[in-house]
Interface confidence: low
């Protein structure tokens, strides 16, 4: 039961090793219950990031020792991951779920590639 | 194993109220929705209410809208149906079932018999 | 409201013989429909999920077919233990919607 999912190509943390992205889903059916996972692949292993489930017209609610944070509108999720180092950098996919009521819908985005490059240490000072 | 047990029915005068219980075991409870169906003497199934796993959305049939009220608390792995303002046509035999959303009902309780009559 | 049309509303037939339940919904529901059996006093009992799969456990002689409005319950050899009566339901959208049911008696 596919449905069409959108999200950036690319992205660059910033120097805190936060990364925020737009997944975009074109809902064909009225949920009221919408699933949100961010998958990360890499090396062809897929894992799960972290998920969250949300009312429509609600926050997003990760669990609290997600690295993920996120907003919802309409059919636009804002997502933000917090943490990253440079070996975190990869493809992060974004997996949207309608999961209520029925019918159900899956869609799955063709990821966006995540740089994370470590600061510099600063140098010691005189 | 899976087990649902309903609990509840009995004999209520037509505008009474009756609260149903089901009781799940053998699964994760809060991951699935849940669904009332009940059936008339000598007649088919009817969708009664369905909730869903975190109790966020709850749907009802036309029939009962607004008497009667779904719930569930994902803490005692309990599914609830309030029914108020009832009358004879909600006398029936009421069926908690595991709801699967698009993959239909996999399992159901027992049922428990509910008599609307004065 | 998605109407569920089932037919026949019953039928007799003998062990060993072929039989087929239909199910036409009033709009596509795609495959989002199953099939139950039920027997007297107890509750009903899953056959066939997303309208062909087969519910584990349940005896291959059972199968189910079809997409969007036109749905069909086939039991290849009728045994003895088959005698129930079969509703399909809709689940693809709310409110649900069973079938008006078919019960398979022994001829």
């Known amino acids: 039961k596919a449905m069409h999912v959108a999200q950036p190509a690319v992205v660059l943390a910033n120097s805190r090793g936060t990364a925020s992205f737009v997944c975009e889903y074109a809902s064909p059916g009225k949920a009221t219950e919408v699933r949100v996972t961010v998958l990360r692949q890499a090396d062809s292993q897929v894992t799960e990031v972290c998920a969250a489930t949300y009312m429509m017209g609600n926050e997003l609610t990760f669990l609290d020792d997600s690295i993920c944070t996120g907003t919802s509108s309409g059919n636009q999720v804002n997502l933000t991951i917090q943490g990253l180092r440079a070996m975190d950098t990869g493809l992060y996919i974004c997996k949207v779920e309608l999961m209520y009521p029925p019918p159900y819908y899956m869609g799955i985005g063709n990821g966006t590639q995540i740089y994370v490059i470590d600061p510099e240490p600063c140098p010691d000072s005189d | 194993e899976v087990q649902l047990v309903e609990s509840g029915g009995g004999l209520v005068q037509p505008g009474g109220s009756l609260r149903l219980s089901c009781a799940a075991s053998?699964?994760?409870?809060?991951?699935?929705?849940m669904s009332w169906v009940r059936q008339a003497p000598g007649k088919g199934l009817e969708w009664v209410s369905a909730i869903s796993g975190g109790g966020l959305s709850t749907y009802y049939a036309d029939s009962v809208k607004g008497r009667f009220t779904i719930s569930r608390d994902n803490s005692k792995n309990t599914l609830y149906l309030q029914m108020n303002s009832l009358r004879a046509e909600d006398t029936a035999v009421y069926y908690c079932a595991k709801d699967l959303l698009w993959l239909g009902f996999d399992y159901w309780g027992q049922g428990t018999l509910v008599t609307v009559s004065s | 409201d998605i109407q569920m049309t089932q037919s026949p509303s019953s039928l007799s037939a003998s062990v060993g013989d072929r039989v087929t339940i239909t199910c036409r919904a009033s709009q596509a529901i795609r495959n989002d429909l199953g099939w139950y059996q039920q027997k007297p006093g107890k509750a009903p009992k899953r056959l066939i999920y997303?309208?062909?799969s087969l519910q584990s456990g349940v005896p291959p002689r059972f199968s189910g077919s079809g997409s969007g409005t036109e749905f069909t319950l086939t039991i290849s050899s009728l045994q003895p233990e088959d005698f129930a009566t079969y509703y399909c339901l809709q689940h693809n959208s709310y409110p649900l919607t069973f079938g008006g049911g078919t019960k398979v008696e022994i001829k």
């Open positions: 053998g699964f994760t409870f809060s991951n699935y929705a």
């Open positions: 997303a309208a062909s």
